[in-house]
Amino acid sequence: PEPPTACREKQYLINSQCCSLCQPGQKLVSDCTEFTETECLPCGESEFLDTWNRETHCHQHKYCDPNLGLRVQQKGTSETDTICTCEEGWHCTSEACESCVLHRSCSPGFGVKQIATGVSDTICEPCPVGFFSNVSSAFEKCHPWTSCETKDLVVQQAGTNKTDVVCGPQDRLRA
């Protein structure tokens, strides 16, 4: 029969024949022959391979370096790499999460639209009319201006995006 030019899924072509790939968690020791199956070997501790493969070396588990603000979110197995995330108050600088930076704070006049996570930074938004923020914070939203009317008071000083309104007593009409 003609030697194959393509192989089935989870197989690879070598020396004009189709050999089985090694399953996740194992590496290739020797290719199959006409008479023998592919020989695979489990990855050792601290190693992994996460796909059907013909790799001759397993990969080393990633190290979540605390000096870079990283911590382990999930320990690696023979089939998965370690997943790193950032310490509280920090977030990853990339999808691979190789280092962390401090969460951004929203300046006065801006409030937190979305609180940061281990993988995303704080999202700030300008305080719209009727709202203010007088602090730099990674958690505080814009606060609504105080409603003087509900306190039977009047606005003595208008609010801004950075300051609340100042309420004062109503001027009494003299008899």
Partner: antibody
Framework: EVQLVQSGAEVKKPGATVKISCKVS????????IHWVKQRPGKGLEWMGR????????KYDPKFQGRVTMTADTSTDTAYMELSSLRSEDTAVYYC???????????WGQGTTVTVSS | DIQMTQSPSSLSASVGDRVTITCSAT?????ILWFQQKPGKAPKLLIY???NLASGVPSRFSGSGSGTDFTLTISSLQPEDFATYYC?????????FGGGTKVEIK
């Protein structure tokens, strides 16, 4: 600074049980496997087993199976190794050590000497 | 269980000598670790994943091999290298150490 600090030397009678602690600092114990290694006076290293502190999963060398129990308390970042039915051949230094990551290369405790004598 | 056999069990060498220690496994393993131990001290990891130097380990140490046969080489022995060396496999439970090789001063 990363440290594995083991409990002090013990003297036990044959048939007794010993429990050694290994307190880690400078890292989260759940991020590593903790291995225990035995070394008899003037002899080589013997792997006893390991524990995954995160879920308590253990693997023991069959030669210690039934006599050894490894546990971990993640709230205090401490691993324990208990060895029962002690005999004179258990007189040894016992070490705790971690799995390695590229960047840490495995840490070791200072060792705990256990003497079994009647 | 996988047996790890180290040879020689001891050797005498002089400062500056090239020293080779072998470690043989009864079945193929993914990698081995090499440890150095000095009297009264805990072992120290020298080489991980067969051939990679651990942090702070001098470049005169090197590791090689695959499958069942592995080698630790010290290219030029230094006074601080006189110690006992152990290989360990961490592929199959129970993980096992070689019997050790004691490197002594000639």
């Amino acid at each position: 600074e990363v440290q594995l600090v083991q409990s002090g030397a013990e003297v036990k009678k044959p048939g007794a049980t010993v429990k050694i602690s290994c307190k880690v600092s400078g890292f989260n114990i759940k991020d590593y496997y903790i291995h225990w290694v035995k070394q008899r006076p003037g002899k080589g290293l013997e792997w006893m087993g390991r524990i995954d502190p995160e879920d308590g999963d253990t693997k023991y060398d069959p030669k210690f199976q039934g006599r050894v129990t490894m546990t971990a308390d993640t709230s205090t970042d401490t691993a324990y190794m208990e060895l029962s039915s002690l005999r004179s051949e258990d007189t040894a230094v016992y070490y705790c050590t971690t799995s390695y990551y590229v960047g840490t290369y495995g840490y070791w405790g200072q060792g705990t000497t256990v003497t079994v004598s009647s | 269980d996988i047996q790890m056999t180290q040879s020689p069990s001891s050797l005498s060498a002089s400062v500056g000598d090239r020293v080779t220690i072998t470690c043989s496994a009864t079945s193929s393993v993914s990698y081995i670790l090499w440890f150095q131990q000095k009297p009264g001290k805990a072992p120290k990891l020298l080489i991980y994943s067969t051939s990679n130097l651990a942090s702070g380990v001098p470049s005169r140490f090197s590791g090689s091999g695959s499958g069942t046969d592995f080698t630790l080489t010290i290219s030029s022995l230094q006074p601080e290298d006189f110690a006992t060396y152990y290989c360990q496999q961490r592929t199959f439970y129970p993980y096992t150490f070689g019997g050790g090789t004691k490197v002594e001063i000639k």
